[in-house]
Interface confidence: low
């Protein structure tokens, strides 16, 4: 079980970094992060570390309320501050392992 | 007020090489994504390539991948594409432009442009 | 890479004509469509991204509509300075970022 949380999340930041690159990826990611209602795979930083196009911008499905553009220079109050690697985990643990 | 002022145009051999410049003012540099749009005479838009506000991302139009480099230097405001074994077909006129904060891809400033002629 | 197809490629109008621009993109590409215009010898101006924000500074008289595959630029009452060069152009699937050919839009 912990070798396949450590997969998921080493995975999922990999997919974190091709974000801006892929837009087959990018769907993926924002499907995961807005049915979970999380952002990023720690924590919504986590995307401050990804050199995409633009600074001081989160994916628009991190936000509460998804419009597009609601990433730019986003209120921390307005996205889901919990990270996607232990909440998709924690759904993983408690309906697959 | 934004200004984007393109330079290094110029009458060039097939095969030769050609740095084209854009000159930044009005904004904060480096918070953006720039790009460079080519328009060949009385032809539409081509987007050629874009740049992160960090140099961290970098894309290419197939036409001219291996070819042409984007840079940025963002202490001196300045973005550059330097053209390598250029071809009659690169011909037109070179806009820089800024993309929106949030919308790296949407440019919401150009400058009036710089004419490249690959003509032997 | 996505393909954008505008049409009419050109039209004629008259000053206070409602004219209406459509792009077709060959996939959905949500609501990630802009619109920009160009006049003779001028560079390209932002007019409406993400379909149908209306960039700062653009009179009231232009809007845009549609997601998905469909989207139209409508100009509600044509003024003299409108005739220009409009260009649609995706910014979901990138890179390449891509351009519609262009609709060319003539006094009557």
């Known amino acids: 079980r912990d070798k396949v949380m450590s997969e998921f999340n080493n995975n999922f930041r990999q997919q974190m970094e091709n974000y801006p690159k892929n837009n087959h990826t990018a769907s993926i990611l924002d499907r995961m992060q807005a049915d979970f209602k999380c952002c990023g795979a720690a924590n919504y930083t986590d995307w401050e570390k990804i050199p995409s196009m633009s600074k001081n911008r989160v994916p628009d499905s991190c936000c509460i309320n998804v419009t597009v553009g609601c990433g730019i220079n986003f209120n921390e109050k307005a996205i889901h501050k919990e990270g996607c690697v232990e909440k998709i985990g924690g759904w993983l643990r408690k309906n697959v392992l | 007020e934004v200004q984007l002022v393109e330079s290094g145009g110029a009458l060039v051999q097939p095969g030769r090489s050609l740095r084209l410049s854009c000159a930044a003012s009005?904004?904060?540099?480096?918070?953006?994504?720039m790009h460079w749009v080519r328009q060949a005479p009385g032809k539409g838009l081509e987007w050629v390539s874009g740049?992160?506000?960090?140099?961290?991302?970098?894309g290419y139009a197939d036409s001219v991948k291996g070819r042409f480099t984007i840079s940025r230097d963002n202490a001196k405001k300045s973005l550059y594409l330097q053209m390598n074994s250029l071809r009659a077909e690169d011909t037109a006129l070179y806009y820089c432009?800024?993309?929106?904060?949030?919308?790296?891809?949407?440019?919401?400033?150009w400058g009036q442009g710089t004419l490249v002629t690959v003509s032997s | 890479d996505i393909q954008m197809t505008q049409s009419p490629s050109s039209l004629s109008a008259s000053v206070g004509d409602r004219v209406t621009i459509t792009c077709r993109a060959s996939?959905?590409?949500?609501?990630?469509l802009n619109w920009y215009q160009q006049k003779p010898g001028k560079a390209p101006k932002l007019l409406i991204y993400?379909?149908?924000s209306l960039q700062s500074g653009v009179p009231s008289r232009f809007s845009g509509s549609g997601s998905g595959t469909d989207f139209t630029l409508t100009i509600s009452s044509l003024q003299p300075e409108d005739f220009a060069t409009y260009y649609c152009?995706?910014?979901?699937?990138?890179?390449?970022?891509?351009f519609g050919q262009g609709t060319r839009l003539e006094i009557k």
């Open positions: 432009g800024k993309g929106l904060l949030h919308q790296w891809e949407v440019l919401d400033y």
């Open positions: 009005g904004f904060t540099f480096d918070d953006y994504a």
């Open positions: 740049i992160s506000w960090n140099s961290g991302t970098m």
């Open positions: 996939q959905s590409i949500s609501s990630y």
């Open positions: 993400a379909a149908s």
């Open positions: 152009q995706q910014s979901y699937s990138t890179p390449p970022i891509t």
